[in-house]
């Protein structure tokens, strides 16, 4: 992978070498297994409309209240676990997208099947939306493209 | 209201030029991308350039490459489409709209009626 | 580059079901977005792949994405539902893709 030829990027792979991605990747298995068990859920229909009105007149604001309470008892360790991580990149959308493609990564091989693996990067690009945190755009979550710092 | 006008539209000669503007109000503009979209006359639509929240980065369709630049003035809260160099082909109806930011590579959230663009001699 | 194939039409009739299909290499892996365009006005956002439906949508609308196609389905169609659809898809060889957009006829 190229490396970023930017100020910041010693100061991002210290985050990531940091920061422990496990819960996340935990978090996401736990989630589409258990939506493989539930005879798969409709991506178009989650429990969370990030559209609604009470949030923001056309789309929530990335600083209002989470949706994901981090205090809230349903929430599972895991992904409470990984919201902190994930927060540390709230500020450089370049490095969280690194952090989601790390997390692609170090998931791919125990993946079985392409729609295993779809469902997978599906759960994985609404991460940042169920910690409450902005999602970095222009981010490549292919695990077998080469010129994939392009973010 | 939530919402993005386009102005600066109009009939220009193959070769001139052209800026567009998008003024913003409502929301808060620095966390966006925002984007430029046309739609020739009874075709379909076509992303032509974005530019990220601090203007850091910007990219383009190829096919305006070199002619076309994207800035954004965050204080104005209004982005720019400085068009240089026009072909006839270029005609169309130019939409500004933003890049929603909750989801990993969202979609275009926010539409402006969008400005009509025609060259021609 | 990225293309994003769908049907130039579709035509159904009140009350039924309307299917639009977007076909992508391996789109069920992509964030789907789609948009409804009538005629003079501006694209709107109605459905996303992966939040689903916009709060301004109502919920005859909806979709799926798996494989090498995304569906977008509008049940119960009503005379307002006329209008061009369109996919679109963020790609990193290509950008923002739009497909080129399926004209939805209610008889």
């Known amino acids: 992978r190229q490396q970023w030829e930017l100020q910041g990027d010693r100061r991002c792979q210290s985050q990531l070498e940091r920061a422990n991605l496990r819960p996340c990747e935990q978090h996401l298995m736990q989630k589409i297994q258990r939506d493989e068990d539930s005879y798969g859920r409709d991506p178009y229909s989650p429990s969370q409309d990030p559209y609604s009105p009470s949030q923001d007149p056309d789309r929530r604001d990335p600083y209002s209240p989470s949706p994901y309470d981090r205090r809230g008892a349903g929430s599972s360790q895991h992904q409470e676990r990984c919201c902190n991580e994930l927060n540390e990149f709230e500020n450089n959308q370049r490095c969280m997208c690194e952090a989601l493609q790390q997390i692609m990564e170090n998931q791919s091989d125990r993946l079985q099947g392409r729609q295993q693996e779809q469902q997978f990067k599906r759960e994985l690009r609404n991460l940042p939306q169920q910690c409450g945190l902005r999602a970095p755009q222009r981010c490549d979550l292919e695990v077998e493209s080469g010129g994939r710092d392009r973010y | 209201e939530v919402k993005v006008v386009e102005s600066g539209g109009g009939l220009v000669q193959p070769g001139g030029s052209l800026r567009l503007s998008c003024a913003a109000s409502e929301f808060t503009f620095t966390y966006y991308w925002m984007s430029w979209i046309r739609q020739a006359p009874g075709k379909g639509l076509e992303w032509v350039a974005n530019?990220?929240?601090?203007?850091?980065?910007?990219y383009y369709v190829d096919s305006v490459k070199g002619r076309f630049t994207i800035s954004r003035d965050n204080p104005k809260k209004t982005v720019y489409l400085q068009m240089n160099s026009l072909r006839v082909e270029d005609t169309a109806v130019y939409y500004c709209a933003r890049v929603g930011t909750t989801v990993v590579n969202d979609g275009f959230d926010l539409w402006g009626l969008g400005t009509m663009v025609t060259v021609s001699s | 580059s990225y293309v994003l194939t769908q049907s130039h039409s579709v035509s159904v009739a009140p009350g039924q079901t309307a299917r639009i299909t977007c076909g992508g290499e391996?789109?069920?892996?992509?964030?789907v977005h789609w948009y409804q365009q009538k005629p003079g006005q501006a694209p709107l956002l109605v459905v996303s792949s992966d939040t689903g439906r916009r709060s301004v949508t109502p919920d005859r609308f909806s979709g799926s994405n798996s494989g090498d196609t995304a569906t977008l389905i509008i049940s119960r169609v009503e005379a307002g539902d006329e209008a061009d659809y369109y996919c679109?898809?963020?790609?990193?060889?290509?950008?923002?893709?739009f497909g080129s957009g399926t004209k939805v006829t209610v008889l």
């Open positions: 679109q898809v963020w790609d990193p060889t290509s950008e923002y893709v």
């Open positions: 530019v990220n929240g601090d203007a850091t980065e910007k």
């Open positions: 391996n789109i069920g892996g992509k964030g």
